[in-house]
């Protein structure tokens, strides 16, 4: 029952004499395992015997009988699924039908497979895409309906008989669906491949040729062009003529239109294969090509670079950068179109040739003021010398130069004068716009660059000015050298170091802080009386009479200055002591008598002592000794002693006479 047997295998298998056949095959016997398998060659059913007749290539029976072909033909299947067969080697007379007679316990089946064995290896088949265009990648396929495990083969690609260097990918299939060997080659054909023969060659494992297939490539491509120019080097001079010819070396399909391009732009009314340029100008220099189109698209020739040679054009100078700051760098560029390029440049500065400068550029690394001026250049090539323009002006900016502060007054300057100074400079670019002065003062600037100092001070020593444009340049300070009378005159005691005592040696110094001019004279005075003309006033032995108010004067050619009055104080022990009596030296008893100790002392007497005629000190220590009531026995000679910090002094004796009163006399 056919519905119970299901087979899958290729319908026909192909091979050649001496090769092998591998027949992939699967089956399903639904009622149980396979019990008998016979492989027939061209089986025919015999109705009489109800059996198949034919050459038995393989037989697998219960009794285990195996025909002699068993070594060449192998059943590689099993009892329930696999029915794969191998014939190795395969022969020409194996062509025909193979019959697989299958028997199970209850069922029988004859499965037929076609085998096509050729005398020689059959050729593979090359498959091409419907259209091939240049530079577009295509896949070339070489297919051979053969594959067998026991007979390795290879497929090789050749272009015009030469192996193609592109890597091909070979694949094989030995399945129940198909048996083949395939080689795929990815390839980007160029226009030059058009009409070329591509071969797929079948080779055995050793690389021995077995068969091949060939195709001629039909590569669609834009027109391929060659451009020819007269003169051949495409170098002409202005006024010459030039001819360019466009030749089509290949086009597939045929070309339709022709045009010419210069620098990528189409030239109008130029639609033939020849381009004639008469009396060329330098503007016609450029890259020329012809363009021819077909259905694929436009094709362009290589470019011809037409060089129209001409003498240098009028030159101009470009300055980087003007104005330039002194010390910066500047570059000059000589701009002059020429073909061929100028071989020599001549540079001029302020009309004078700059020696050794023959390049297109002139670089000055450190600009100085004298570099300012006009720069021009002239370019030269084999065809002549260019027109030299008026040039470009370099402006060099720098701070004011050689700035000086100048005193306008007649010299010398005296304290209190009005002084005028001017700020001068040698050169400046840009112009000076302002001035600065130092030190700063409340001075007036009556005009730009002039400074007026009213009532100049003795201590205005130096003044400096700066002239300023974009920068300030300072002059060296100028000394005003202001002359003035001596200053800060004062009396200073040199000796003694401590207070002055009578009899000391004393020196007074007349000091001053400054004087201009330095030459001075000194004068000492006391109470309007001139004492000396030296800087010092000396006392060998000072006496109290020298005490008083002293002044010194210092004068120079400008004027004189007096010190403050200085008081000279002489310290001495009490002197000229005397005892004075009041109301007199004769006093009546009972009255009051006052004795006073008079003295001259510096410092004043601080302590008094009274003595009587017996040199007996009395218990009284004040300047006055008051006797009240006075008694007759108080009569006698008295003296006093005065003491100060310097020493002591004593008075001579003074006699007090106390007489009796009339009452006393009356009583007696």
């Amino acid at each position: 029952d056919s519905s119970k047997w299901v087979f899958e295998h290729p319908e026909t298998l192909y091979a050649w004499e001496g090769a092998c056949v591998w027949i992939p095959c699967t089956y399903r016997a639904l009622d149980g395992d396979l019990e008998s398998f016979i492989l027939f060659h061209n089986p025919e059913y015999n109705k009489n015997t109800s059996k198949f007749d034919g050459t038995r290539l393989y037989e697998s029976t219960k009794d285990g009988k195996v025909p002699s072909e068993q070594k060449r033909v192998q059943f590689l299947g099993d009892k329930n699924k696999n029915c794969t067969l191998s014939i190795h080697p395969v022969h020409l007379n194996d062509s025909g039908q193979l019959g697989l007679r299958m028997e199970s316990k209850t069922e029988k089946w004859m499965e037929r497979i076609h085998l096509n064995v050729s005398e020689r290896p059959f050729p593979p088949h090359i498959q091409l895409p419907p259209e091939i265009q240049e530079s577009q990648e295509v896949t070339l396929t070489c297919l051979l309906n053969f594959s067998c495990y026991g007979y390795p083969i290879q497929l090789q690609w050749l272009l015009e008989g030469v192996p193609m260097r592109q890597a091909a990918v070979t694949s094989t299939s030995l399945t129940i669906k198909s048996v083949f060997t395939r080689s795929e080659l990815k390839f980007s054909p160029q226009w030059s491949h058009h009409g070329k023969i591509v071969t797929c060659q079948l080779q055995d494992a050793d690389g021995k040729f077995l068969s091949n297939d060939t195709v001629q490539l039909n590569v669609k491509h834009t027109p391929k062009l060659e451009i020819k120019v007269t003169p051949s080097d495409a170098i002409v001079r202005e006024g010459d003529s030039v001819t360019m010819t466009c030749e089509v070396s290949s086009s597939n399909p045929e070309y339709t239109t022709v045009s010419w391009l210069k620098d990528g732009t189409s030239l109008k009314k130029q639609n033939t294969f020849t381009l004639n340029l008469r009396e060329v100008t330098k503007d016609q220099s450029g890259k020329y090509c012809c363009q021819v189109s077909n259905d694929v698209g436009p094709g362009r020739s290589e470019e011809v670079f037409l060089q129209v040679q001409y003498a240098p054009e009028p030159s101009t100078v470009q300055i980087l950068h003007s104005p330039a700051v002194e010390g910066s760098q500047v570059e000059f560029l000589c701009m002059s179109l020429a073909n061929p390029l100028p071989t020599n440049y001549t540079w001029y500065h302020n009309g004078k040739e700059m020696q050794g400068r023959t390049e297109e550029k002139v670089h000055i690394p450190k600009i100085l003021p004298w570099h300012a001026g006009t720069y021009s250049c002239v370019a030269e090539n084999i065809l002549g010398t260019g027109q030299r323009g008026p040039g470009a002006e370099l402006d060099v900016q720098y701070p004011p130069k050689k700035v000086t502060t100048v005193i306008q007054n007649p010299m010398p300057i005296r304290e209190g004068d009005t002084v005028t100074l001017s700020c001068n400079y040698n050169s400046s670019n840009p112009s000076v716009t302002r001035y600065e002065w130092k030190p700063h003062g409340a001075w007036e600037e009556p005009s730009l660059g002039v400074l007026k100092i009213q009532n100049v001070g003795w201590d205005n020593t130096t003044i400096a000015c700066a002239a300023c444009n974009s920068w300030c340049s300072w002059a060296s300070p100028v000394a005003l050298n202001v002359q003035y009378a001596p200053r800060d005159v004062r009396v200073r005691k040199i000796k003694p170091l401590s207070e002055i005592h009578s009899g000391n040696s004393v020196s007074l110094q007349c000091d001053f802080s400054s004087s201009h001019p330095k030459e001075v004279q000194f004068f000492w005075e006391k109470n309007g009386r001139l004492l000396g003309k030296e800087s010092q006033l000396n006392f060998d032995s000072i006496s109290p009479e020298d005490a008083g108010s002293y002044s010194c004067w210092v004068n120079n050619s400008i004027g004189q200055t007096a010190s403050k009055a200085w008081t000279l104080e002489v310290l001495y022990a009490p002197r000229r002591l005397r005892v004075s009596m009041s109301p007199g030296d004769q006093v009546m008893e009972g009255k009051s008598a006052t004795l006073t100790c008079e003295s001259d002392a510096n410092p004043p007497v601080s302590h008094y002592t009274w003595f009587d005629w017996n040199n007996q000190s009395l218990p009284y220590h004040s300047q006055k000794l008051r006797l009240e009531p006075v008694k007759v026995q108080h009569s006698g000679a008295y003296w006093c002693q005065g003491t100060n910090s310097v020493g002591k002094g004593r008075s001579p004796l003074s006699t007090l006479t106390v007489y009796y009163s009339p009452e006393t006399i009356g009583r007696r």
Epitope: D283, G351, A372, G373, Q387, G389, P390, G391, E393
Partner: antibody, heavy 118, light 116 residues
């Protein structure tokens, strides 16, 4: 409006001197090179002298070299031509001319007449 | 030597187009030149600066009727729709600085007469 006004022309004896002035207005004088041209009666134009913007570059025609001096005062917008050792063939109308572009003598004064005759 | 050559005179009908030629010495064919107009008893007037490629810049107050062009060593001044006030001597000039000497050369001038 650009204006160039020449003055200083007149009659002078051969060997004598004359100083021509040209007052410029209506443009930045210090931005332009200046020239003196002359035209003898019934004759063509002749270039005499050129001075650059900053007086750095000065050129003279061979016929006047050593006798004429061109100068300018940019602060006063004035161009000068000091002429000495004058000859009879220096007789001409003298024009003060501004130079722009390449060598474009783009503005001309009305001229001042110089006659050298004994 | 730098030389400019001009024809001495040319006559044109009123409203016609005029084309004046100034030819540079052959080795100076790339030079920039200037055109000037001089009317009797007047100073020259700057008309235009003209380059080898025909590009030009005209002076102030010059009508659009004036244009310039070039071919090789020839420099042209064209006046379209010529008017009576265009009657003048047209002079071309060229400047150059050779070595350390400046020169400014004039052509002989073309006297233009406007007829009718």
């Amino acid at each position: 409006e650009v204006q160039l006004v020449e003055s200083g022309g007149g009659l002078v004896k051969p060997g004598g001197s004359l100083k021509l002035s040209c007052a410029a207005s209506g443009f930045t004088f210090s931005d332009y090179g200046m020239n003196w041209f002359r035209q003898a009666p019934e004759k063509g134009l002749e270039w005499v002298a050129y001075i650059s913007r900053g007086s750095h570059t000065i050129y003279y025609a061979d016929t006047v070299k050593g006798r004429f001096t061109i100068s300018r005062d940019n602060a006063k917008n004035t161009l000068f031509l000091q002429m000495t050792s004058l000859r009879s063939n220096d007789t001409a109308m003298y024009y003060c001319v501004r130079m722009a572009g390449y060598y474009a003598m783009d503005y001309w004064g009305q001229g001042t007449s110089v006659t050298v005759s004994s | 030597q730098l030389v400019l050559t001009q024809s001495s005179s040319a006559s044109f009908s009123l409203g016609a187009s005029a084309k004046l030629t100034c030819t540079l010495s052959s080795q100076h064919s790339s030079y920039i030149i200037e055109w000037y107009q001089q009317q009797p008893l007047k100073p020259p007037k700057y008309v235009m600066e003209l380059k080898k490629d025909g590009s030009h810049s005209t002076g102030d107050g010059i009508p659009d009727r004036f244009s310039g062009s070039s071919s090789g060593a020839d420099r042209y001044l064209s006046i379209s729709n010529i008017q009576p006030e265009d009657e003048a001597i047209y002079i071309c000039g060229v400047g150059d600085t050779i070595k350390e000497q400046f020169v400014y050369v004039f052509g002989g001038g073309t006297k233009v007469t406007v007829l009718g």
